[in-house]
C-alpha cells in the first residue's frame, strides 16, 4: 500500500541532491586552500541532519548550527558584495574581481546555490516530489531557513564599505521582501559598516535615467540612514562595459561613465 505523502506547492528536492552537495564540497575545498581541512562527508551529514526526519514547515536556525560550524569561513569583511534579483551579474563580477565575495563564493553559499531540498516528518526519506513554497505553504522551510541563516551571518560579517548590486529593470529595484531587504539590510552592523554603496544595474541600452532617484532606492537610503550607516548609489548604465572595465581597467573607454 503506497504511503500517503504531503503534497507541497513548490518543486521537490533537486535530483541527486546528496551527490551534488558532496561533489560541490569536494570541489570547493580543492580550489580554496584555506578550506582544505573541511571533511566533506561530515558537512553532508550535518546538512542532512538539519532537515531529514523533520517537518519541512518546522525548521529552525538551530537545526543548521552543526552545518554552520563546519562551514565556518573567514571572509575579508571589507570585500563583501550583496545582491538582489541580479545574481548572475554579481557572480560574473566576483569571478573577475577575485578579491570580492558574494555569499555564493563562500563554502556554504556555494553548496546550496540554486538547489532545493526538504524531508518528511518521521522518515529518513528526502522528498523529491514537492517541497514547501515560501508563500503558499510556509516560511520556515529548509531552504528559506538556510538562506536566512547564512545571509544574516554574512551581513553580520561585513565591515567598512559594503556594496550591493540591484536590478534596475525590476518594478521594485529595492524590495523589502527580498533576502537583502528583509535580512541583510537589518543585520549590517552600524559600528562596523561605514557605508552601503548600491550599484543599480540598468537593463535597457538607451536607458539614461538616474535610477538612484527611484522611490524604492530612497526607501533603502532612509532605512540605512536610520541605522546610522551612510548610503551612496551609482548607476551602472552599461553592465557589459562595466564587466569589461573590471577585467581591463586600463582600457581608454573605461574612464567615461559606465
Amino acid at each position: 500500500v503506497p504511503r500517503w505523502r504531503q503534497q507541497w506547492s513548490g518543486p521537490g528536492t533537486t535530483k541527486r541532491f546528496p551527490e551534488t552537495v558532496l561533489a560541490r564540497c569536494v570541489k570547493y575545498t580543492e580550489i580554496h586552500p584555506e578550506m582544505r581541512h573541511v571533511d566533506c562527508q561530515s558537512v553532508w551529514d550535518a546538512f542532512k541532519g538539519a532537515f531529514i526526519s523533520k517537518h519541512p514547515c518546522n525548521i529552525t536556525e538551530e537545526d543548521y548550527q552543526p552545518l554552520m560550524k563546519l562551514g565556518t569561513q573567514t571572509v575579508p569583511c571589507n570585500k563583501i558584495l550583496l545582491w538582489s534579483r541580479i545574481k548572475d551579474l554579481a557572480h560574473q563580477f566576483t569571478q573577475v574581481q577575485r578579491d570580492m565575495f558574494t555569499l555564493e563564493d563562500t563554502l556554504l553559499g556555494y553548496l546550496a546555490d540554486d538547489l532545493t531540498w526538504c524531508g518528511e516528518f518521521n522518515t529518513s526519506k528526502i522528498n523529491y516530489q514537492s517541497c514547501p513554497d515560501w508563500r503558499k505553504d510556509c516560511s520556515n522551510n529548509p531552504v528559506s531557513v538556510f538562506w536566512k541563516t547564512v545571509s544574516r551571518r554574512f551581513a553580520e560579517a561585513a565591515c567598512d564599505v559594503v556594496h550591493v548590486m540591484l536590478n534596475g529593470s525590476r518594478s521594485k529595484i529595492f524590495d523589502k521582501n527580498s533576502t537583502f531587504g528583509s535580512v541583510e539590510v537589518h543585520n549590517l552592523q552600524p559600528e562596523k559598516v561605514q557605508t552601503l554603496e548600491a550599484w543599480v544595474i540598468h537593463g535597457g541600452r538607451e536607458d539614461s535615467r538616474d535610477l538612484c532617484q527611484d522611490p524604492t532606492i530612497k526607501e533603502l537610503e532612509s532605512i540605512i540612514s536610520k541605522r546610522n550607516i551612510q548610503f551612496s548609489c551609482k548607476n551602472i548604465y552599461r553592465p557589459d562595459k562595466f564587466l569589461q572595465c573590471v577585467k581591463n581597467p586600463e582600457d581608454s573607454s573605461c574612464t567615461s561613465e559606465i
Epitope: 565556518t72 553559499g109 541563516t149 553580520e156 562596523k192
Partner: nanobody
Framework: QLQLQESGPGLVKPSETLALTCNVS??????????WGWIRQPPGKRLEWIGS???????HYNPSLKSRVTISVDTSKNQFSLTLSSVTAADTAVYYC????????????????RGQGTLVTVSS
C-alpha cells in the same frame, strides 16, 4: 554566557609599548567555537578593528597597524593580550576586547561579544 574584561594601564608615554590583557569567562579561549580580537575607538571617531586571533593561533591584523601589533593567547589563564609598540597621541582610545562565534561566514572583526572597554591615554 561569554564575558570579557580588559585590563592594563590607563596611561602610556609616547614611543612606549601599550600592553592590554583580556580575561575570558564563561567559555574556553582555546575552543574552536570562538575567535578573539581587539578593537578601539579614538575620541569622536568610529570604531577601528586592530586585529584578531583564531583557535589555530593564526592572526589577522589591520594593515595600517600591522607593523606595531601583536595579539597572543595564554590558554592556561584563559586570556588573550594586545601589544602595540611605538605609540603616539593618535593611539589614545577606548580599547575593547571582543569575541566572535565561529559559525558560517565570519569577518575578521569579531562582534558577538565585547568587553566594557578601557580608556588608554598616550601622553607624556
Amino acid at each position: 554566557q561569554l564575558q570579557l574584561q580588559e585590563s592594563g594601564p590607563g596611561l602610556v608615554k609616547p614611543s612606549e609599548t601599550l600592553a592590554l590583557t583580556c580575561n575570558v569567562s564563561g567559555g574556553s579561549i582555546s575552543s574552536s567555537s570562538y575567535y578573539w580580537g581587539w578593537i578601539r575607538q579614538p575620541p569622536g571617531k568610529r570604531l577601528e578593528w586592530i586585529g584578531s586571533i583564531y583557535h589555530t593561533g593564526s592572526t589577522h591584523y589591520n594593515p595600517s597597524l600591522k607593523s606595531r601589533v601583536t595579539i597572543s593567547v595564554d590558554t592556561s589563564k584563559n586570556q588573550f593580550s594586545l601589544t602595540l609598540s611605538s605609540v603616539t597621541a593618535a593611539d589614545t582610545a577606548v580599547y575593547y576586547c571582543a569575541g566572535g562565534d565561529r559559525y558560517g561566514p565570519v569577518g575578521q572583526w569579531p562582534s558577538d561579544y565585547r568587553g566594557q572597554g578601557t580608556l588608554v591615554t598616550v601622553s607624556s
